[in-house]
């Protein structure tokens, strides 16, 4: 039975041209985090593998970067960044837990700086 | 010029160990992943395992742990991956690749392995 | 583990012709998908990489598109070079599972 839990940084806003860190938290299991993999919309952006580490895919090298833990920053936003956000734990023996995050990019800088995880 | 150059041809045993080794050059060898690929007589490409030179960290497919040990020796710039309790079915082209996690990009020559009484 | 399914088995195509390859992951892979050319007594030769991204040096009649568990590889215009069997690869998760193949010859 899959007892886990996902905690995210939810709805979240920052300015254009910034950066942001996106962050979940599995909790209320024992399972083993063997992977976690961080996507949007329809592409894969990273994965932290327990045994071999991160990984940024090669079309986002310039403007993700891992961490911290197992969270993920966002650079050099743009508003076509706006949108849905995944993290997707793969667990032993559990299976898979999956967090949403969905991120406005704004243009103005008028951005909401109340989520927490979100850089200054 | 990246190269990845395997070891010769090895015919074994049932119940024998192979290692294969597999030299890199032409790139940072801790910065990419090695990875093990092998495909039997009129079979499709199967996985088996990646080793981070870096950390020395590895993953095996469910199927061959316990049987497989894929090491990286950073000085030598070359990885290895040792089979043991060698079986029929394990006669195949064994390659290494160099890996990006999300592709392997370049491929060694291959090395046949041949198990047979 | 992800089951990558290829469709056809092989493939006969004319000269000039286009070829169209299909791969169906079991479960969901994102864009997780890589394509890659083996020829008889050669090693295998990246093509694809995120499903649709060109590897470098990889002629332009090649293409892939798709997302999620379905994925396309196009030859758009069949050249003697291209007989070959391809291959489809999921790096979504470990074991980074290939697909049967497809085998494409001139017809």
């Known amino acids: 039975m899959m007892t886990g839990t996902i905690e995210t940084t939810g709805n979240i806003s920052a300015e254009k041209g910034g950066s942001i860190i996106l962050q979940c938290h599995l909790s209320s299991t024992t399972a083993q985090v063997t992977q976690v993999n961080w996507e949007q919309q329809d592409q894969l952006l990273a994965i932290c593998n327990a045994d071999l580490g991160w990984h940024i895919s090669p079309s986002f090298k310039d403007r993700v970067a891992p961490g911290p833990g197992l969270g993920l920053t966002l650079q050099s936003l743009t508003v076509n960044d706006t949108g849905e956000y995944f993290c997707i734990y793969h667990t032993y023996p559990d299976g898979t837990y999956t967090g949403r995050i969905f991120l406005e990019v704004l243009e103005s800088s008028v951005a909401e700086h109340g989520a927490r995880f979100q850089i200054p | 010029e990246v190269q990845l150059v395997q070891s010769g041809a090895e015919v074994k045993k049932p119940g024998a160990s192979v290692k294969v080794s597999c030299k890199a050059s032409?790139?940072?060898?801790?910065?990419?992943?090695i990875e093990w690929v092998r495909q039997a007589p009129g079979q499709r490409l199967e996985w088996m395992g990646v080793?981070?030179?870096?950390?020395?960290?590895?993953n095996y497919k469910e199927k061959f742990k316990g049987r497989v040990t894929i090491t990286a020796d950073k000085s030598s710039s070359t990885a290895y991956m040792e089979l043991s309790s060698l079986r029929s079915e394990d006669t195949a082209v064994y390659y290494c690749?160099?890996?990006?996690?999300?592709?392997?990009?370049?491929w060694g020559q291959g090395t046949t392995v041949t198990v047979s009484s | 583990d992800i089951v990558m399914t290829q469709s056809p088995d092989s493939l006969a195509v004319s000269l000039g012709e286009r070829a169209t390859i299909n791969c169906k992951a079991s479960?969901?892979?994102?864009?997780?998908v890589a394509w890659y050319q083996h020829k008889p007594g050669q090693s295998p030769k990246l093509l694809i990489y995120?499903?649709?991204y060109r590897y470098t040096g990889v002629p332009d009649r090649f293409s892939g598109s798709g997302s999620g568990t379905d994925f396309t590889l196009t030859i758009s215009s069949l050249q003697a070079e291209d007989v070959a069997v391809y291959y489809c690869?999921?790096?979504?998760?470990?074991?980074?599972?290939f697909g049967g193949g497809t085998k494409v010859e001139i017809k």
């Open positions: 690869q999921q790096h979504y998760n470990t074991p980074h599972t």
């Open positions: 080793i981070n030179p870096g950390s020395g960290g590895t």
């Open positions: 032409g790139y940072a060898f801790t910065n990419y992943l």
């Open positions: 479960q969901h892979v994102s864009n997780a």
């Open positions: 995120s499903a649709s």
């Open positions: 690749a160099r890996g990006e996690y999300f592709f392997f990009d370049y």
